[in-house]
C-alpha cells in the first residue's frame, strides 16, 4: 500500500492514520472506522469513506431524463458493512436488525426488511448521472470548454479513465455528467465510477477528501463554476426491487446538496 513515503501521509484520503509499519516497512495508511489499509495512490472506496465518516456524517432536450429505475440516495448517511476489499456488502443492516440490499455505490435498492432478507449479489451501478445547477453567471459557459474542463477534472483529480466519462450535457444553468462503467469494462486498477462520483460530490460540497489540497476550484476559461445544487442518479445493471408505492413516488424523493 503506497503513500507519500517522506512523511507518511495519504494524499488521496485525509480520513486515515498513517504509520511506517506496513509490509516491507513501508508507510501504511488505515481508514478511520474500519482500520483497513488503503492504497493511497488511488481513490479510497466509498464504503470505507462512509464508514470513516460515521466514525469521525422538455422536448428536443439535450439533457438526460433519468429512467424509471434511477435511484437517488434518499437514506442519507449510515455506517456500512464493507467486505475485505472495502466494497459494500450486498446486505446492510442497522442496529435494530432492519436490513436492505444495496448496489455497488451503497444506495438502497430494495424495501427494508428483517434479518431474513437475502441479497444474493452486489448489483453493479453501471451508469451515474450527476445533475448540477450552477450559480448565475454573466453568460452561459461555452459547452465544449465546459466539457473539456469536467473531463480533465475527472481524469486528473479523480484518476478516472476518460472512456468512463460518457457525456457532458449543458443547458444553462444545468450541467449533467454521465459516467458509465459496466462490469466487463472495469479492469483491475481502474477507478470505480461510484468512487469518483463520491469524491466529486464531496468536493462540490466543500468537503474535499484529499489530504492537504485546497478545495475544488472549478474554472472554465478562468470563469468560476460555482455549483448551487447537486443531484445524483444511480442506475444499476439489474433494476431495483421496490414495492409499487415506492416506485410510483420515487422521483419526488430528490436528495439535494447545497
Amino acid at each position: 500500500h503506497t503513500a507519500a513515503q517522506d512523511n507518511c501521509t495519504c494524499p488521496t484520503n485525509k480520513m486515515t492514520v498513517c504509520s511506517p509499519d506496513g509490509p516491507g516497512g513501508r508507510c501504511q495508511c488505515r481508514a478511520l472506522g474500519s482500520g483497513m489499509a488503503v492504497d493511497c495512490s488511488t481513490l479510497t472506496s466509498k464504503c470505507l469513506l462512509l464508514k470513516a465518516r460515521m466514525s469521525a456524517p422538455k422536448n428536443a432536450r439535450t439533457l438526460v431524463r433519468p429512467s424509471e429505475h434511477a435511484l437517488v440516495d434518499n437514506d442519507g448517511l449510515y455506517d456500512p458493512d464493507c467486505d475485505p476489499e472495502g466494497r459494500f456488502k450486498a446486505r446492510q443492516c442497522n442496529q435494530t436488525s432492519v436490513c436492505w440490499c444495496v448496489n455497488s455505490v451503497g444506495v438502497r435498492r430494495t424495501d427494508k426488511g428483517d434479518l431474513s432478507l437475502r441479497c444474493d449479489e452486489l448489483v453493479r451501478t453501471h451508469h451515474i448521472l450527476i445533475d448540477l445547477r450552477h450559480r448565475p453567471t454573466a453568460g452561459a459557459f461555452n459547452h465544449s470548454d465546459l466539457d473539456a474542463e469536467l473531463r480533465r477534472l475527472f481524469r486528473e483529480r479523480y484518476r478516472l479513465h476518460p472512456k468512463f466519462v460518457a457525456a457532458v450535457h449543458y443547458e444553462q444553468p444545468t450541467i449533467q455528467i454521465e459516467l458509465r462503467q459496466n462490469t466487463s469494462q472495469k479492469a483491475a486498477g481502474d477507478v470505480d465510477i461510484g468512487d469518483a462520483a463520491y469524491y466529486f460530490e464531496r468536493d462540490i460540497k466543500g468537503e474535499s477528501l484529499f489530504q492537504g489540497r485546497g478545495g475544488l476550484d472549478l474554472r472554465v476559461r478562468g470563469e468560476p463554476l460555482q455549483v448551487e445544487r447537486t443531484l445524483i442518479y444511480y442506475l444499476d445493471e439489474i433494476p431495483p426491487k421496490f414495492s409499487m408505492k415506492r416506485l410510483t413516488h420515487h422521483h419526488h424523493h430528490h436528495h439535494h446538496h447545497h
Partner: antibody, heavy 115, light 107 residues
Framework: QVQLVQSGAEVKKPGASVKVSCKAS????????IHWVRQAPGQGLEWIGT????????VYNQKFRDRATMTADRSISTAYIELSRLRSDDTAVYYC????????WGQGTTVTVSS | EIVLTQSPATLSLSPGERATLSCRAS??????IHWFQQKPGQSPRLLIK???ESISGIPSRFSGSGSGTDFTLTISSLEPEDFAVYYC?????????FGQGTKLEIK
C-alpha cells in the same frame, strides 16, 4: 533500542478502576500505534484496543468500549489504559505493544481483581 | 470480526523434527497475519510479520507462508527452546484478533 516499560502489578477490588502505564523509548513515540492486549491466567491473548499517539485517535474492541479508556501523553512518551468497573474476570496480565504487528512488547502488568 | 482458527491445538514433536502450524482466517485478509511465540511467564515475541517477512534476530529455521485465508508457520528443525505456545494475529482491519494458540510440546 526500542523499549516499552510498564507500571507495576496492581490489586483491585471489584467495581474499582485501574490505570496501567506504558513508557516508550528508543523510537519516535508519535508515529507508531500502541496496542493493549491482555491475557487471563492460562488463556490466550485478547486485543483490547489501540491508540495512535500523534493525534490520540483510539479504537476499542467492542467488548471493552464502555469500560476502557486509552490515552497518550506525548510529552513523556507514555501510553495509558484505564479499565473501570473491574470484575474478577478482568484478572489478567495487561501488555502494551508497538505497531500493527506488535514488534515490541512491554513486560506486562499483572492486575488482580479480588474482594 | 475476523476469526482466526489455529490447528492443531497441541502438537507433540521431538527436537530435530519439522513443525507445521496452521492459522485459518474467517475471511480474506491478504497477508496481514503475524506469528508470535510465548513461553511461560514471558511476553510474546514476534517471529514473522505479514505472513512471510522475517524478523531481525529470529533464527532462520522459522518461516511463514500463505495469503488470503490460509497461513502456515514452519519450524524447519526443532530446537529444545522452540517448545512454547504459538499465536497468529491479524492486522487486516479492526478489531485485531488472535488465534487461540497452538501448544508445541516435546514428544
Amino acid at each position: 533500542q526500542v523499549q516499552l516499560v510498564q507500571s507495576g502489578a496492581e490489586v483491585k477490588k471489584p467495581g474499582a478502576s485501574v490505570k496501567v502505564s506504558c513508557k516508550a523509548s528508543g523510537y519516535s513515540f508519535t508515529t507508531h500505534w500502541i496496542h493493549w492486549v491482555r491475557q487471563a491466567p492460562g488463556q490466550g491473548l485478547e486485543w483490547i484496543g489501540t491508540i495512535f499517539p500523534s493525534n490520540a485517535y483510539a479504537v476499542y474492541n467492542q467488548k471493552f468500549r464502555d469500560r476502557a479508556t486509552m490515552t497518550a501523553d506525548r510529552s513523556i512518551s507514555t501510553a495509558y489504559i484505564e479499565l473501570s468497573r473491574l470484575r474478577s474476570d478482568d484478572t489478567a496480565v495487561y501488555y502494551c505493544a508497538r505497531a500493527s504487528y506488535f514488534d515490541y512488547w512491554g513486560q506486562g502488568t499483572t492486575v488482580t481483581v479480588s474482594s | 470480526e475476523i476469526v482466526l482458527t489455529q490447528s492443531p491445538a497441541t502438537l507433540s514433536l521431538s527436537p530435530g523434527e519439522r513443525a507445521t502450524l496452521s492459522c485459518r482466517a474467517s475471511q480474506n485478509i491478504g497477508t496481514s497475519i503475524h506469528w508470535f511465540q510465548q513461553k511461560p511467564g514471558q511476553s510474546p515475541r514476534l517471529l514473522i510479520k505479514y505472513a512471510s517477512e522475517s524478523i531481525s534476530g529470529i533464527p532462520s529455521r522459522f518461516s511463514g507462508s500463505g495469503s488470503g485465508t490460509d497461513f502456515t508457520l514452519t519450524i524447519s528443525s526443532l530446537e529444545p527452546e522452540d517448545f512454547a505456545v504459538y499465536y497468529c494475529q491479524h492486522s487486516h482491519s479492526w478489531p485485531f484478533t488472535f488465534g487461540q494458540g497452538t501448544k508445541l510440546e516435546i514428544k
